[in-house]
């Protein structure tokens, strides 16, 4: 089989601070040295890019400075964290992995992680 399998959790609940973390694991058919990981959000059949990072195997995963994502990599596993989430951001977050180099190129699409975000209740004013 030439397809690359990507595994990710089915459901994740964001913290009260709007932070959600999940692991994206891929079964590499070859020895990739350059990998691109993209987080996509799917809502009502529309797909948008949340963040993306290209890394060399053995090096750290680096997202752009203004990205809402951070991450670390270890072998064929990527630990992804998405920050600044609000209730309206609840949705399906798909992990996409591309083995860019060396040839052949492989594409792997995960089934998606449903991230639930609940906005925290505002603190009541203190009478003290």
């Amino acid at each position: 089989c030439k397809a690359m399998h990507v595994a990710q959790p089915a459901v994740v609940l964001a913290s009260s601070r709007g932070i959600a973390s999940f692991v994206c694991e891929y079964a590499s058919p070859g020895k990739a040295t350059e990998v691109r990981v993209t987080v996509l959000r799917q809502a009502d059949s529309q797909v948008t890019e949340v963040c993306a990072a290209t890394y060399m195997m053995g090096n750290e995963l680096t997202f752009l400075d203004d990205s809402i994502c951070t991450g670390t990599s270890s072998g064929n596993q990527v630990n992804l964290t998405i920050q600044g989430l609000r209730a309206m951001d609840t949705g399906l977050y798909i992990c996409k992995v591309e083995l860019m180099y060396p040839p052949p190129y492989y594409l792997g699409i995960g089934n998606g992680t449903q991230i639930y975000v609940i906005d925290p209740e505002p603190c009541p004013d203190s009478d003290f």
Epitope: A3, M4, R36, P104, Y105, I109
Partner: antibody
Framework: EVQLVESGGGLVKPGGSLRLSCAAS????????MHWVRQAPGKGLEWVSF????????YYADSVKGRFTISRDNAKNSLYLQMNSLRAEDTAVYYC???????????WGQGTMVTVSS | EIVLTQSPGTLSVSPGERATLSCRAS???????LAWYQQKPGQAPRLLIY???SRATGIPDRFSGSGSGTDFTLTISRLEPEDFAVYYC?????????FGQGTKVEIK
């Protein structure tokens, strides 16, 4: 409007060269991989070449390897195909296509005709 | 290289009838990586189905895809006059990206 527009096709003699261009508009060009696909008269679709987001990685069909070079300029939202040592069998309509976020070629240009004949 | 073989080469169908097109891969293709395209004379191909069964934006629900492994199917439930065209399957899970040779759906 989200679109791709190819240009640069024409008639060229065997052994000659041609440079195709593809102008992208209406989307963040650097967030997508890009491809060239060709179609010989009356024939099916044949993938020609691929280029990664930043242009660092490039792949080619065996039939054009060593003769064609793909490149992109993200600042200009443009994709290119430099075709050298052209042969009669390279005669085709050449399409640029966007590699969609989930992988399929979700946006195509209108195509540009390349004819290689003496 | 994954070779895709489409059948039949030509399908003659009357408007309103059902059309079933087949695409067979030389080795297993993950269902997430199989697409179908429609091409009319003088036009560029248009994405119909991706991920074996998901309809692209704006594609009517009379088009449906199914299958897994090495066998995939495109079904057009009720052929409209504008559906007479050539249809291609494609795998995009690994390089080289490959297309089937196409199935022409013509008016009977």
């Amino acid at each position: 409007e989200v679109q791709l527009v190819e240009s640069g096709g024409g008639l060229v003699k065997p052994g000659g060269s041609l440079r195709l261009s593809c102008a992208a508009s209406g989307f963040t060009f650097s967030s997508y991989t890009m491809h060239w696909v060709r179609q010989a008269p009356g024939k099916g679709l044949e993938w020609v070449s691929f280029i990664s987001y930043d242009g660092n990685q490039k792949y080619y069909a065996d039939s054009v390897k060593g003769r064609f070079t793909i490149s992109r300029d993200n600042a200009k939202n443009s994709l290119y195909l430099q075709m050298n040592s052209l042969r009669a069998e390279d005669t085709a309509v050449y399409y640029c296509a966007r590699g969609g976020l989930l992988g399929p070629f979700d946006l195509w240009g209108q195509g540009t005709m390349v004819t290689v004949s003496s | 290289e994954i070779v895709l073989t489409q059948s039949p080469g030509t399908l003659s169908v009357s408007p309103g009838e059902r059309a079933t097109l087949s695409c067979r891969a030389s080795q297993s293709v993950g269902s997430s990586y199989l697409a179908w395209y429609q091409q009319k004379p003088g036009q560029a191909p248009r994405l119909l189905i991706y991920g074996a069964f998901s309809r692209a934006t704006g594609i009517p629900d009379r088009f449906s895809g199914s299958g897994s492994g090495t066998d995939f199917t495109l079904t057009i439930s009720r052929l409209e006059p504008e559906d007479f065209a050539v249809y291609y399957c494609q795998q995009y899970g690994s390089s080289p990206w490959t297309f089937g040779q196409g199935t022409k759906v013509e008016i009977k």
